[in-house]
């Protein structure tokens, strides 16, 4: 029988390095066997390049395309093949689809003012336009209760969020994880950083009464309980309301 | 030493045709595009085709398209123009430049860095 | 097509003093942030063609620094300061932008 797409290519930059394409067949297909995908650079002199597709499922194809650091007015031409038939032909433009890079090395420390640091790479380097076009979103959930979650948008300069132990749930075991967009490229979010998890020991302070500061916050000033940690908290019903399309 | 050596040039009467070579040197041709530049007696400079480092996309000036076939032999390190149904307007000194690198997914462009010496093309009854 | 104009088309300097060539396209050559694509030749007499400058600005191997380009998007300039005798020739524009490749008319530099 005839190969159909059933959904055409969809593409994403990470705008340095790299651009996925996916789309789905209507029938389960052999990506790698059976298809392939060309895309050349809408520049004179530039080449024809192939990309092998895998299976992301039975019939949903992926293909990573190395493309060279993305700037503004790079189109590419796409081509999708099986054998000699073309089956979807169509142009992808990195900049206006931007997925950003997965922010790395999620760590949490304990700091001043009975306070957990939470702090994460920012995955492009300096002289990468997205580098300082980055805000995040934080996501710290309770391991034990789904109801105890809280989201954090962290939109001002610098890769950390200083969440107060108050807060959490005390000897409760928590987990965050940390994504990116990029506003001024209209980007979509990027994939979740890997979950690193903590025990919050945390008492209301009116318990403490004289009682010495359990560890990890021995020693900590006690004042502060109370500051808010230069990010702005949402809701999750309104943040779910909101982006729950990306 | 990176050298570009062209050949083939000869008097040729309107209508017939002629086939051009540029033997490259001192550099990996096949990663290169390369093109052929023309000037006409007492003239400027007018480009005349681009071949990419594969020979996978070719461009042509106007007013030899469908006359001139652009093409190269990687083994070789030589690039070819074959010149058919010439005409009295295509005298001139053919030079064969080097062009872009093409090996990256943008062509990194440094300007037609190096050129031949010339052949001298003469269309004439 | 992208029109390359240049002026003057003939220039008389003496030798130490400084020439200027300007070059404007019809569309802009800038691709992005400082790519300009386009550069200067000088053709000297009964010689080929030889490069100068590439990307508007970039003086390509074994040009001396005398030489400078300048400018972006439609609006370029060469400057040959402390001109010599050997500078002259026939000096041309070219965009390397898009095909099909055009050049400038050329500008004659004369040393008095």
């Known amino acids: 029988g005839s190969v159909k797409v059933l959904h055409e290519p969809s593409c994403f930059s990470d705008y340095i390095s790299t651009s996925v394409c996916q789309w789905k067949m209507d029938h389960p297909t052999n990506c790698s066997a059976e298809l392939r995908l060309s895309y050349q650079l809408d520049f004179m002199g530039s080449e024809n390049h192939t990309c092998v597709p895998e299976n992301r499922e039975d019939s949903v194809c992926v293909c990573s395309m190395p493309i060279d650091d993305a700037v503004e007015a790079d189109v590419y031409q796409l081509d999708l093949w099986a054998g000699q038939q073309l089956l979807w032909s169509g142009s992808f433009q990195p900049s206006k689809h931007v997925k950003p890079r997965t922010p790395g090395n999620l760590t949490v420390h304990p700091n001043i003012s009975h306070t957990w640091l939470l702090m994460w790479t920012n995955p492009y380097p300096t002289e990468n336009h997205l580098h300082s076009e980055l805000t995040y979103m934080v996501n710290v959930s309770n391991d034990n209760d789904p109801e105890d979650f809280k989201v954090y948008n962290v939109t001002y300069m610098g890769p950390t969020l200083r969440l107060a132990a108050s807060t959490l749930k005390s000897g409760a075991s928590y987990s965050a994880r940390v994504r990116a967009w990029a506003q001024t490229y209209n980007s979509t979010w990027s994939d979740w950083s890997p979950s690193t998890t903590w025990l919050n020991y945390y008492e209301p302070w009116e318990q403490h009464l004289g009682k010495p500061i359990p560890n990890p916050l021995l020693g900590l000033d006690s004042t502060g309980l109370n500051d808010i940690f230069e990010a702005q908290k949402i809701e999750w019903h309104e943040h779910h309301h909101h982006h729950h399309h990306h | 030493e990176v050298q570009l050596v062209e050949s083939g040039g000869d008097l040729v009467k309107p209508g017939g045709s002629l086939r051009l070579s540029c033997v490259a040197s001192?550099?990996?041709?096949?990663?290169?595009?390369m093109t052929w530049v023309r000037q006409a007696p007492g003239k400027g400079l007018q480009w005349v085709s681009l071949?990419?480092?594969?020979?996978?996309?070719?461009y042509y000036a106007d007013a030899v398209k469908g006359r001139f076939t652009i093409s190269r032999d990687n083994a070789k390190n030589t690039l070819y123009l074959q010149m058919n149904s010439l005409r009295a307007e295509d005298t001139a000194v053919y030079y064969c430049?080097?062009?872009?690198?093409?090996?990256?997914?943008?062509?990194?462009?440094?300007?037609?860095?190096?050129w031949g010496q010339g052949t001298l093309v003469t269309v004439s009854s | 097509d992208i029109v390359m104009t240049q002026t003057p088309l003939s220039l008389s300097v003496s030798p130490g003093e400084t020439a200027s060539i300007s070059c404007r396209s019809s569309?802009?050559?800038?691709?992005?942030?400082?790519?300009?694509?386009l550069d200067w030749y000088l053709q000297k007499p009964g010689q080929s063609p030889q490069g100068l400058i590439y990307?508007?600005?970039k003086r390509m191997s074994g040009v001396p620094d005398r030489f400078s380009g300048s400018g972006s998007g439609t609006d370029f300039t060469l400057r040959i300061s402390r001109v010599e005798a050997n500078d002259t020739g026939v000096y041309y524009c070219?965009?390397?932008?898009?095909?099909?490749?055009?050049f400038g008319q050329g500008t004659k530099l004369e040393i008095k």
């Open positions: 070219m965009q390397g932008l898009q095909s099909p490749l055009t």
């Open positions: 071949i990419s480092g594969s020979g996978g996309k070719t």
């Open positions: 569309q802009s050559l800038l691709y992005s942030i400082g790519y300009n694509y």
């Open positions: 990307l508007g600005s």
């Open positions: 001192g550099f990996t041709f096949r990663d290169y595009a």
């Open positions: 430049a080097v062009d872009r690198l093409t090996k990256t997914i943008r062509p990194q462009y440094y300007g037609l860095w190096v």
